[in-house]
């Protein structure tokens, strides 16, 4: 059980106050983290509170400003990047968001040696992506879907690609579906370790159907946003990978990297690229039916000026029970011999663990094992491997950092974080300097987040980087809800849940219950993290009990739970929420006449299906930006879990799992449907179809749209949204305003 101290003592009770909705909307109780921008084994950059860029040397204890806030302000810079030779800094301004990761910006190059901006051969604007080479100060950037190279910041650019076209050909940047569902980055180019080569992806979207929606703006006529967006079963982007020698790029030109034959025989995806050395690269490919992944190691042949990917260096990863990998196929972390690597994949018992691959996947040596999962490999050095897992005390929603000594035999394992601040910190991530000489630990909770700096050899804490003292003080007079993380055992399924309880919770009383659900494949909602958010307010001020439940399909508890939803989305996720609610009712403190459910995105889909389950458990519920039919969602994501919407594959379940098919069942619940009209991700179409089905079934419901808002419903829409949802729930639960 994780109990958040409510800090309520009788003597203090008068000075304590509940959270208000205003607190949440103003971000009054938001926390800070500190991630060093490492530039060597012992140095990092950090942007100070007054916006100076400061270089810190851990070993000398010295720090100095490398770039003043005056310089930053002169171009309204919101971000920066130091060249590896430390001669130049790029300054980023005019940030303009595109999709989840992508944005365009204006870039200025500042010469640190003379304290002036580089004049002549300035960069064009707006740029879609820009990065330094890993050594020296070469620049690669993407402008109007083409890639350019500068040997030095003041040099004229060399154009590497010429076929880039808006919404047609993307070079060095992903198209919509690769950005959102495969790469999870704004870029699709990768420098080799010493900057000799530049690899990049070309995405051809010429044949992809286009989603079009109105953007109302302020003009007399709305404009139409067009995005090549492959929905389930539609034509996909065609991807090619090229590598160019950046020393004399005009000589040989870009060289295409061959696709493994077993992949190229049908539709496929490129999933990631990892440089091993300057002359060895590792590419990962995935069949469109995403249960077969191939990792291909390619070598540069100087005499041929080509990239050779021998079949003997192809490693196949296949899933027989679900899809390949977790949310994504894991990426390899190469060891110092530049051919063997460490990788997370399912072991024979169906738990994701670290394996060491020297020759073939079949001969892989398992490094970690147990009924828990390795989650991320942070760093491999000559003698240590650092990773995170949820092994400690068998809580799947925790993350601790471990070190395995790979230099000694047998390898020994040490938990670096388990006992550091045990009550406060149970969910960590880490950031390592070169050669893991030092590292930062960022603890996200369950207590107030704290970031600390550590010695990579001894694991000794060197200093606190950020401890959120202001937040701690601000919370001293706040009645925070209590939180507990527990599990239910139902029909051989373990359902972990987090319950958020009002500050003066009394088990003998009855409380309204709100289920917050996401429930998407390979997600996890029950995590030991700190948050003061909308549901904290609902518990603190409005006296609701809020519960989050991780059911079948969720992550980090083994393949049996994860792959249970394979090819049948919308069934077990909903069943498990309902099962949990019944168990909560049995606990005796839930008013069974006042139970609601809400979710966003995938959670909106699950909440809609739960409301339409016909159980009579839910009085009301909210779906924000829900998927309503898997035929409307992106191919890469949907087909991973559902296969294809074709007669000979899985069309029947695509049809059976829609929200619209259950329109009649909404008759006895209060339903609030919410969507942004400019949602590029889960298209407004989804809610439009739900609304149409409900109207056709003559079922009353409430709805709210947010004009020109995307999937995030940000800015003023956020305030309106949470205010609106609060009113809806209070009305549903008969709570006075």
């Amino acid at each position: 059980i994780v109990l958040r101290p409510s800090r309520v003592h009788n003597s203090e009770e008068n000075t304590m106050r509940a959270l208000t909705l205003k607190d949440i909307l103003n971000g009054t109780f938001s926390y800070k983290t500190f991630f060093p921008n490492w530039i060597s084994g012992q140095e990092y950059l950090h942007q100070s509170a007054d916006n100076n860029i400061v270089l810190y040397n851990i070993e000398t204890g010295q720090s100095y400003t490398i770039l003043s806030n005056r310089t930053m302000k002169s171009v309204n810079a919101s971000n920066y990047g130091l060249s590896p030779d430390r001669q130049f800094v790029y300054l980023e301004s005019d940030y303009s968001k595109l999709w989840r990761y992508s944005y365009t910006a204006t870039y200025y190059i500042y010469d640190l040696s003379n304290g002036e901006f580089v004049r002549g051969n300035e960069l064009p604007r707006p740029i879609q992506y820009l990065c330094w080479s890993p050594v020296g100060s070469k620049l690669a950037y993407v402008y109007q879907n083409n890639i350019y190279l500068k040997q030095r910041p003041g040099d004229p650019p060399f154009q590497i690609t010429f076929n880039g076209r808006e919404n047609k050909i993307f070079n060095g940047i992903p198209d919509w579906v690769y950005e959102e569902e495969m790469l999870a980055t704004k870029y699709a180019l990768w420098w080799s370790p010493n900057g000799k080569f530049l690899a990049y992806a070309e995405f051809n979207d010429t044949d992809i159907p286009v989603i079009a929606y109105s953007y109302y703006g302020d003009e007399q006529y709305p404009r139409t946003i067009n995005i090549p967006y492959p929905k389930a079963g539609a034509k996909n982007p065609v991807v090619r990978i090229f590598i160019i020698d950046t020393t004399y790029p005009a000589y040989v030109g870009p060289q295409e990297v061959p696709v493994p034959a077993m992949i190229a025989s049908s539709d496929y995806y490129f999933s990631w690229l990892t440089w091993v050395t300057d002359e060895r690269v590792c590419l990962q490919w995935l069949k469109r039916v995403q249960n077969v992944s191939v990792l291909s190691i390619c070598d540069f042949r100087e005499d041929w000026q080509t990239w050779d990917c021998p079949k003997t260096q192809e490693h196949i990863e296949e899933s027989r029970t679900g899809w390949a990998g977790g949310f994504f196929v894991s990426t390899p972390v190469f060891s110092y011999d530049a051919i063997s690597y460490y990788k997370i994949f399912s072991d024979k018992d169906g738990y994701k663990h670290i394996h060491y691959i020297k020759d073939t996947v079949e001969n892989a040596i398992q490094i970690t094992s147990g009924k828990w999962e390795a989650i991320n490999i942070f760093r491999v050095t000559q003698d240590s491997l650092f990773y995170s897992s949820n092994e400690f005390e068998e809580y799947p929603g925790r993350r601790n950092i471990y070190r395995i000594s790979i230099g000694s035999y047998p390898p020994s394992k040490k938990c670096v974080t388990c006992h550091l601040r045990k009550e406060r910190c149970q969910y960590y991530t880490a950031s390592f300097s070169d050669y893991a000489k030092y590292y930062a630990l960022v603890c996200y909770g369950p207590g107030i987040p704290i970031s600390t700096l550590h010695d990579g050899r001894t694991d000794q804490e060197i200093k606190i980087l950020e401890e959120n003292k202001e937040l701690e003080n601000a919370l001293k007079n706040i009645q925070l809800p209590k939180e507990e993380i527990k599990k239910l055992e139902v029909d051989e399924i373990t359902l972990w849940y987090k319950m958020i309880l009002p500050p003066q919770f009394d088990r003998s009383k009855k409380y309204p219950l709100l289920i917050q659900v996401y429930g998407g494949p390979c997600s996890q909602s029950v995590r030991s993290v700190f948050a003061v958010n909308w549901i904290s307010y609902l518990a603190s001020k409005e006296g609701m009990v809020i519960a989050l439940v991780d059911g079948r399909g969720t992550a980090f508890q083994g393949d049996k739970l994860l792959y249970a939803v394979y090819r049948k989305l919308g069934v077990y996720e909903v069943e498990d929420q309902i099962t949990a609610v019944r168990k909560f009712i049995e606990m005796g403190f839930i008013d069974e006449k006042r139970i609601a459910i809400w979710g966003w995105s995938y959670g909106g889909y699950v909440s809609s299906l739960a409301l339409a389950s016909g159980t009579g458990l839910f009085k009301c519920g909210i779906a924000v930006a829900p998927v309503s039919s898997w035929e409307y969602y992106a191919s890469v994501y949907t087909e991973r879990f559902m296969g294809l919407p074709t007669k000979d594959d899985n069309l029947e379940h695509y049809k059976n799992s829609t929200v619209m098919a259950r329109a009649e069942y909404f008759r006895n619940v209060d339903y609030l449907l919410i969507h942004g009209t400019a949602d590029d991700n889960v298209h407004f179409q989804n809610s439009a179809q739900i609304a149409k089905a409900l109207v056709n079934a003559q079922v009353d419901f409430q709805a709210m749209w947010y004009s020109d808002q995307n999937h995030g419903l940000s800015g003023l829409s956020t305030n309106h949204l949470y205010t609106h949802m609060t009113h809806f729930l209070k009305q549903c639960f008969s709570l006075s305003d």
């Epitope: 154009q159 090619r240 000589y251 040989v252 030109g253 295409e256």
Partner: antibody, heavy 117, light 108 residues
């Protein structure tokens, strides 16, 4: 030893067509971008066209765009230049050269194309 | 397109003398993309220098290249009889790649 051997030149009337070939040997042909460069009698060098190693990308000088087509057959180690709608100003020695935009490290001996009525 | 202007048009020198050939670009060219070629009558051009200063395979060390930005130079330290020819500079910075009009080095 790298060798490039052009053929297919000759006399052609304005508006006519000609197809030049360049047989390559001594290197992994499919790995390299290749170019055509021409030289009008008594004049300097002018880049005409280039093609990537796989043949997937082609590039042309404005003066020949829409009239000339560069292609390659990697199984035959041969580079081609299909020239249509020929004009008097296309009269030149045509060289095939190894390289994309430069440097061009190996050149053929050239083949003369004369456009005249 | 980038225009390359070579000077002088003709250079009359004796064997053993030093030859300095200039190539000026209408806009900045990164040194990685500047090359020099030699062409003798009735022959194909031959690559001498690439990357503004790197000698191609088999090129004697009396040939050297230098320069950056818009001004580049080819130097032949001691002219040999076989060096009398036409020399072209070439840029690959922008499409289309362009050549200078050439400098003829002739025997004085």
């Amino acid at each position: 030893e790298v060798q490039l051997l052009e053929s297919g030149g000759g006399l052609v009337q304005p508006g006519g067509s000609l197809r030049l070939s360049c047989a390559a040997s001594g290197f992994t042909f499919s790995s390299y971008a290749m170019s055509w460069v021409r030289q009008a009698p008594g004049k300097g060098l002018e880049w005409v066209s280039a093609i990537s190693g796989s043949g997937g990308s082609t590039y042309y000088a404005d003066s020949v765009k829409g009239r000339f087509t560069i292609s390659r057959d990697n199984s035959k180690n041969t580079l081609y230049l299909q020239m249509n709608s020929l004009r008097a100003e296309d009269t030149a020695v045509y060289y095939c050269a190894k390289g994309w935009l430069g440097p061009f490290d190996y050149w053929g001996q050239g083949t003369l194309v004369t456009v005249s009525s | 397109e980038i225009v390359l202007t070579q000077s002088p048009g003709t250079l009359s020198l004796s064997p053993g003398e030093r030859a300095t050939l200039s190539c000026r670009a209408s806009q900045s060219v990164s040194s990685s993309y500047l090359a020099w070629y030699q062409q003798k009558p009735g022959q194909a051009p031959r690559l001498l220098i690439y990357g503004a200063s790197s000698r191609a395979t088999g090129i004697p060390d009396r040939f050297s290249g230098s320069g950056s930005g818009t001004d580049f130079t080819l130097t032949i330290s001691r002219l040999e009889p076989e060096d009398f020819a036409v020399y072209y500079c070439q840029q690959g910075q922008l499409i289309p790649p362009t050549f200078g009009q050439g400098t003829k080095v002739e025997i004085k």
